[in-house]
């Protein structure tokens, strides 16, 4: 098996999850 | 420094089992929500799983092509998050990164699934 | 799903000079909070992919200035003020708004 290693990819110490939403719900088909 | 530490990857045969894992330094992990991506040639960038926090009763989501045959889990204890596959397809090739929310991303592990 | 189109496909931009990348949702992307999940990522030549906006316009820590993001609801563009070097590699948007989380194609960024 193969290990690789990621560095920060921003600045910030502390991973930001304010790009999901909170609660999602599935796309719903139209 | 943030640094998340993908292993597990490598060559397996169609319908086997392998387990990824990823350890996170660096950050608090605990308040993480965590994520599986896998890129390849074909599909482009594909989500797999999220695992939610303690804070959202370590909620797990899942794209529909791998569900039932997907896990995702963590130990927030050594700031880990897996992904156990099994029954694997020829399509599951790609590199699989760990990414804590789309935030932070680390290197890809590549799996291949191949007879 | 929610299916993300990108264009252009790629671009050739002289250093210095500005760069444009649409994206297109198939469903608005604004959840019930008021807030739109909508992310751009970059992806550097053999490495992995890096966010550099969230929620339509919110830059990531430590990401240029030169880098910003605008739209609503369904149709959504980064910017590059002034493409530099270093910007070379594939753009990606992404929502996060509902499940799956869904990618587009992607935009690759050449320097002329």
């Known amino acids: 098996s193969e290990t690789t290693t990621g560095t920060s990819s921003n600045s910030s110490q502390s991973t930001s999850n304010s790009g999901l939403a909170p609660n999602p719900t599935n796309a719903t088909t139209k | 420094e943030v640094k998340f530490e993908e292993s597990g990857g490598g060559l397996v045969q169609p319908g086997g089992s392998i387990k990824l894992s990823c350890a996170a330094s660096?950050?608090?992990?605990?308040?993480?929500?965590m994520d599986w991506v896998r890129q390849s040639p074909e599909k482009g960038l594909e989500w797999v799983a999220e695992?939610?926090?303690?804070?959202?009763?370590?909620?797990?989501y899942y794209a529909e092509s791998v569900k039932g045959r997907f896990t995702i889990s963590r130990d927030d204890s050594k700031s880990r998050v897996y992904l156990q596959m099994n029954n694997l397809r020829t399509e599951d090739t790609g590199i699989y990164y760990c990414?804590?929310?789309?935030?932070?991303w680390g290197q890809g592990t590549s799996v291949t699934v191949s007879s | 799903d929610i299916v993300m189109t990108q264009t252009p496909l790629s671009l050739s931009v002289t250093i210095g000079q500005p760069a444009s990348i649409s994206c297109k949702s198939s469903q608005s992307l604004l959840y019930s909070n008021g807030k739109t999940y909508l992310n751009w990522l970059q992806q550097r030549p053999g490495q992995s992919p890096k966010r550099l906006i969230y929620q339509v316009s919110k830059l990531d820590p430590g990401i240029p200035d030169r880098f910003s993001g605008s739209g609503s609801e369904t149709d959504f563009t980064l910017k590059i003020s002034r493409v530099e070097a270093e910007d070379l590699g594939i753009y990606y948007c992404m929502q996060g708004t509902y499940l799956p989380w869904t990618f587009g194609g992607g935009t690759k960024l050449e320097i002329k």
């Open positions: 695992i939610r926090d303690k804070t959202k009763n370590y909620v797990t």
């Open positions: 660096g950050v608090p992990f605990s308040g993480a929500w």
């Open positions: 990414t804590g929310a789309m935030d932070y």
